[in-house]
Interface confidence: low
């Protein structure tokens, strides 16, 4: 498709061959808008409308909408993994983001591709924000937004893990790594984790621990494993460099409180 083959690491999906297409059921009769199914799906389905819950594994939001975690969400990527985002008006999100987070000048900006703007796209922000396959969402935790973008190459589909800054410049891992010294160890672990997703057959990071970072890239004091269904993941406390602090853990029954730590 419109994505270029050389950008960043990719998680390859199975090609949409005749066998896959044979499983497709056309969308329901009353569809305001058709979008491709989430993940590596090959079929069409109805887009979600404004205000509907959404996430990485749900149907995609419709044109002009983005899947956005709640602004006060402590772990926005987990919220999106769990389908706890909401389809919100994209322009409203952009205005809010521009108002609250003026983008710092970034070297080597590349203009956003058409595919990145296409309707029905799915971006999943990782510790910071999120909506074929597209636009960045605002979340005040990070100066960069990590998105997992769905693209197409010939007859196969793939997921690209790119960085998108508030100013909507798109950069891949190699260009980002040149500036990694600007970020703390948590940010680098997060990048490594996302990088490893490319080895998965399908993009299904449930169970992959993506660290909870502050805006400078250091570890937030409270870290948690992903939830499994209704079972809450256990949490623990760390210092700003990610070293566990003894005596602060929970197996999910009760919440853990991490007091008087350097990194919030």
């Amino acid at each position: 498709g419109a994505s270029s083959a050389g950008l960043g690491p990719v998680v390859r999906c199975e090609p949409c061959d005749a066998r896959a297409l044979a499983q497709c059921a056309p969308p329901p009769a009353v569809c305001a808008e058709l979008v491709r199914e989430p993940g590596c799906g090959c079929c069409l389905t109805c887009a979600l409308s404004e205000g509907q819950p959404c996430g990485i594994y749900t149907e995609r939001c419709g044109s002009g909408l983005r899947c956005q975690p709640s602004p006060d969400e402590a772990r926005p990527l987990q919220a999106l993994l769990d389908g706890r985002g909401l389809c919100v008006n994209a322009s409203a999100v952009s205005r809010l983001r521009a108002y609250l987070l003026p983008a710092p000048p970034a070297p080597g900006n590349a203009s956003e591709s058409e595919e990145d703007r296409s309707a029905g796209s799915v971006e999943s922000p990782s510790v910071s924000s999120t909506h074929r396959v597209s636009d960045p969402k605002f979340h005040p935790l990070h100066s960069k937004i990590i998105i997992i973008k769905k693209g197409h190459a010939k007859d196969s589909q793939r997921y690209k893990v790119d960085y998108e800054s508030q100013s909507t410049d798109t950069q891949n891992f190699s260009s980002e790594s040149k500036r990694e010294t600007e970020y703390g160890p948590c940010r680098r672990e997060m990048e490594d984790t996302l990088n490893h997703l490319k080895f998965l057959n399908v993009l299904s990071p449930r169970g992959v621990h993506i660290p909870n970072c502050d805006k400078k890239g250091f570890y937030k004091k409270k870290q948690c494993r992903p939830s499994k269904g209704r079972k809450r993941g256990f949490c623990w406390c760390v210092d700003k460099y990610g070293q566990p602090l003894p005596g602060y853990t929970t197996k999910g029954k009760e919440d853990v409180h991490c007091y008087s730590m350097q990194s919030k």
Epitope: C16, A18, C24, A25, P26
Partner: antibody, heavy 119, light 110 residues
């Protein structure tokens, strides 16, 4: 070999109806849609509508709403396009085309059916 | 649904490149990457040449390429050959679950 074979040419009087058939073979009929496209003499392609061969859902071009009906018979893997209240400007070659839900394109075409509306 | 806008004609000599544009709106070309291009020789059915803006079906020469910027899609044919002389139509999926074609461009190989 995937193919769509359409019914033969028709000559109709104004006000009459025409029903064009399109028989699919070489692929799973219900896994794709069928689009209908027409082309008046010396003119460009005009998209008429599409039908889901899986559940019969239809979407028609606004211009033809109320005059066109698309159906699909899964037992024979055949799609039909029925156009009513024919006018002289409906004279055209009518094509059916397989609509792929993967690539949003019409990737296999029938040979065309000439419909002439004349008194 | 208005037809997408294409130039009525285009021409080029063998070996040259020619680009055909297709302009729509944010509800069709600009809103989706579901733009396709079709080639039609006189008296024949159309043939899919490009889908999803820039993908070629198997069997289509790599001389054919597609791109998109904003509300305008483009088909480029490089290394023109005599058999490329035909009518070319763009098509786009629209926000109302329908498709729309361009008016067509007659390509002449000089």
């Amino acid at each position: 070999q995937m193919q769509l074979v359409q019914s033969g040419a028709e000559v109709k009087m104004p006000g009459a109806s025409v029903k064009v058939s399109c028989k699919a073979s070489g692929y799973t009929f219900t896994s794709y849609g069928i689009s209908w496209v027409r082309q008046a003499p010396g003119q460009g392609l005009e998209w008429m509508g599409w039908i889901s061969a899986y559940n019969g859902n239809t979407y028609y071009a606004q211009k033809l709403q109320g005059r066109v009906t698309m159906t699909a018979d899964t037992s024979t893997s055949t799609a039909y396009m029925d156009l009513r209240s024919l006018r002289s400007d409906d004279t055209a070659v009518y094509y059916c085309a397989r609509l792929s839900y993967y690539n949003y394109a019409m990737d296999v075409w029938g040979q065309g059916t000439t419909v002439t509306v004349s008194s | 649904q208005s037809a997408l806008t294409q130039p009525p004609s285009a021409s080029g000599s063998p070996g040259q490149s020619v680009t055909i544009s297709c302009t729509g709106t944010s509800s069709d070309v600009g809103g989706y990457n579901h733009v396709s291009w079709y080639q039609q020789h006189p008296g024949k059915a159309p043939k899919l040449m490009i889908y999803e803006v820039s993908n070629r079906p198997s069997g289509v020469p790599n001389r054919f390429s597609g791109s998109k910027s904003g509300n305008t899609a483009s088909l480029t044919i490089s290394g023109l050959q005599a058999e490329d002389e035909a009518d070319y139509y763009c098509s786009s999926y629209t926000s109302s679950n329908t498709w729309v074609f361009g008016g067509g461009t007659k390509l002449t190989v000089l």
